[in-house]
């Protein structure tokens, strides 16, 4: 229903705390360089204005759209052009073009320093002094680094953060209480970020239909007892929620997500038997819980998929009558039978089925043509299954760090033109798939591995889009989202690449490396590994292992030496010489 004042409506629905949090996230995602204080001031002004509209919906400007209100606020910021360059040109446009312009200027890789966590004592002091400001800083810092972070979910992570601090800051050993818990939240939030970015990419590049297909597959796997009409309703609602968040309409998004959670909890009987635990929780926890609820038990009496989609006499008529509905029912029926497949794989199968009907239904004898379609799915299913087996075997053999290195070598050979920091980031993220997925039960591995890899590769594509340097990467990134992972997997050594010349300074290290945290040490070593591969793209695994073992030994020796600086300056050049010889 239409409301006289959109801002009053959202303020009333969301409540002051969530309203302010979402407005802060929105501003931080649009203007990523502004300080917390600048944004906090704007948020307060918007909140005060919303309250006047709640008191009187007919007050001046209360009838304006949220985009108009927020856009006007952003455009009133002093020194916009000096700080943001051509983004300031957006302010010359009218809505909705202005908002579209802001969206186009969101930066997936802003040049901001890594978000450093203060030490425990300092963190607890500032948290106790002003929990609201502390949480505001958290929302601001995460949102500006992740401009597509799913806003209502970020509120959930802030709430988690709050609970951890409340608990741990009361403990004697704050550090050992906080570190593992906050690390856990950080890891989950980073995964959430890349997954949501993938959803927004799907929406931006391929439209609502593509996202809705993803949602139908995912929901059908989770709720195999829900009928097609129920799944379609949930997929339509979920598509609307994600469209709003991806489009920067964060208040609407959070409000509609709350509505969807309410609907699901009121209709558990027709959706799933597994929702009750989630539905007993407060709003943010409830919505989060529903988004990752375990799969319901599959109905025991499902007929073979072939009955309706191959053997039925009216396959082509049903397809002709309503293509999207027929393909949707195929995706639904196939997905509910296969919680053990990735959504990407299910969408590839649906695409194959669609292509088969397009071809076969135009022939004189369609049934003879499409009769083998399910058998033709086999190679499509085997490929990701083999990928999972090979990679999990390798992970189990090498451990996470070794597995990341193996991936780093592989991907540097596939796309040596890509910048080393991007390759290292991608390989580290791709390598985490082992820890995340390979320890799961067999039937959960494939969906975990492939859907996670797809999300990470989407980030690789986004970063590469900014500065395209590799034809291999461009080729894989310009295809459909579901084909990207198989495309990257199939890439081999880039034969067109002219190896980098060997520069001694690239492999020269100093004693400061010894005091770095383990993660930073690993990144330094992985940076060197990528540079070695760029120098010798066809180096064997054995050669690279020899060099990396030597390198690790060198670091270990010099970091234990009494005079570290002398050790690095005398042993370093010897290491460089040995490396050159080993790779010759």
């Amino acid at each position: 229903e239409a409301h006289k004042s959109e801002i009053a409506h959202r303020y009333n629905d969301l409540g002051e705390q969530h309203f302010k949090g979402l407005v802060l996230i929105a501003f931080s995602q649009y203007l990523q360089k502004c300080s917390y204080d600048e944004h906090a001031k704007l948020v307060q002004e918007v909140t005060d204005f919303a309250k006047t509209c709640v008191a009187d919906e007919s007050a001046a400007n209360c009838d304006k759209s949220l985009h108009t209100l927020f856009g006007d606020k952003l455009c009133a910021i002093p020194n916009l052009r000096e700080n943001y360059g051509e983004l300031a040109d957006c302010c010359t446009k009218q809505e909705p073009e202005r908002n579209e312009c802001f969206l186009q200027h969101k930066d997936d890789n802003p040049s901001l320093p890594p978000f450093e966590r203060p030490e425990a004592e300092a963190m607890c002091t500032s948290f106790k002094e002003n929990p609201t400001t502390f949480m505001g800083h958290y929302l601001h810092e995460v949102a500006r680094r992740h401009p597509y972070f799913y806003a209502p979910e970020l509120l959930y992570y802030a709430e988690q953060y709050n609970e951890i601090l409340t608990q741990c800051c009361a403990e004697a050993d704050k550090e050992s209480c906080l570190t593992p818990k906050l690390d856990g939240v950080k890891e989950k939030a980073l995964v959430s970020s890349v997954r949501q970015r993938m959803k927004c990419s799907s929406m931006q590049k391929f439209g609502e239909r593509a996202f809705k297909a993803w949602a139908v597959a995912r929901l059908s796997q989770t709720f195999p007892n829900a009928d097609f009409a129920e799944i379609t309703k949930l997929a339509t609602d979920l598509t609307k929620v994600n469209k709003e968040c991806c489009h920067g309409d964060l208040l609407e998004c959070a409000d509609d997500r709350a509505e969807l959670a309410k609907y699901m909890c009121e209709n558990q009987a027709t959706i799933s038997s597994k929702l009750q635990t989630c539905c007993d929780k407060p709003l943010l926890k409830k919505a989060h819980c529903l988004s990752e609820v375990e799969h319901d038990t599959m109905p025991a009496d499902l007929p073979a998929i072939a009955a309706d989609f191959v053997e039925d006499q009216e396959v082509c008529k049903n397809y002709a009558e309503a293509k999207d509905v027929f393909l949707g029912t195929f995706l639904y029926e196939y997905s509910r039978r296969h919680p053990d497949y990735s959504v990407s794989l299910l969408l590839r199968l649906a695409k194959k089925y669609e292509a088969t009907l397009e071809k076969c239904c135009a022939e004189a004898n369609p049934p003879a043509c499409y009769g083998t379609v399910l058998a033709e799915f086999q190679p499509l299913v085997e490929e990701p299954k083999n990928l999972v087996k090979t990679n999990c075997d390798l992970y189990e053999k090498l451990g996470e760090y070794g597995f990341q290195n193996a991936i780093l070598v592989r991907y540097t050979q596939k796309a040596p033109q890509v910048s080393t920091p991007t390759l290292v980031e991608a390989a580290r993220n791709l390598g985490r798939v082992g820890t995340k997925c390979c320890t799961l039960p067999e039937d959960q591995r494939l969906p975990c591995v492939e859907d996670y890899l797809s999300a990470i590769l989407n980030r690789v594509c986004l970063l590469h889009e900014k500065t395209p340097v590799s034809e291999h990467v461009t080729k894989c990134c310009s295809g459909s989202l579901v084909e990207r992972r198989p495309c990257f997997s199939a890439l081999t050594v880039d034969e067109t690449y002219v190896p980098k010349e060997f520069k001694a300074e690239t492999f020269t290290f100093h004693s400061d490396i010894c005091t770095l945290p383990e993660k930073e040490k690993q990144i330094k070593k992985q940076t060197a590994l990528a540079e070695l591969v760029k120098h010798k793209p066809k180096a064997t695994a054995e050669q690279l292992k020899t060099v990396m073992d030597d390198f690790a030994q060198f670091l270990d020796t010099c970091c234990k030496a009494a005079d570290k600086d002398t050790c690095f300056s005398t042993e370093g050049p010897n290491l460089v010489t040995r490396c050159k010889d080993a790779l010759a």
Epitope: E314, K317, A320, E321, C361, A362, E363, P366, A368
Partner: nanobody, 115 residues
Framework: KVQLVESGGGLVQPGNSLRLSCAAS????????MSWVRQAPGKGLEWVSS????????LTADSVKGRFTISRDNSKNTLYLQMNSLRAEDTAVYYC????????SSQGTLVTVSS
């Protein structure tokens, strides 16, 4: 909504000819193979002939081969069945179907061959 409407049936003497038409709507006609099937009184459905979406490929049952010809006009969204040298055993209700289906989803047109 897919609609198929057959016409052209009637009473005809053995040895004579008839031309059946099927007007199609509600879908991209040229993207789908089409068929004619028939049902004689008291019998099951029998496949008669099929044609590809482009009209380049046709298939015809042995029982009518050399006598019946299937064709289509994609610009008019219409399927045809030219029936020559009709026999008493060709008496049936004729239906057009999408994609080789042996399921009636239209009214059909009655062809009676009798002297």
């Amino acid at each position: 909504k897919v609609q198929l409407v057959e016409s052209g049936g009637g009473l005809v003497q053995p040895g004579n000819s008839l031309r059946l038409s099927c007007a199609a709507s509600g879908f991209t006609f040229s993207s789908f193979g089409m068929s004619w099937v028939r049902q004689a009184p008291g019998k099951g459905l029998e496949w008669v002939s099929s044609i590809s979406g482009s009209g380049s490929d046709t298939l015809t049952a042995d029982s009518v081969k050399g006598r019946f010809t299937i064709s289509r006009d994609n610009s008019k969204n219409t399927l045809y069945l030219q029936m020559n040298s009709l026999r008493a055993e060709d008496t049936a209700v004729y239906y057009c179907t999408i994609g080789g289906s042996l399921v009636r989803s239209s009214q059909g047109t009655l062809v009676t061959v009798s002297s």
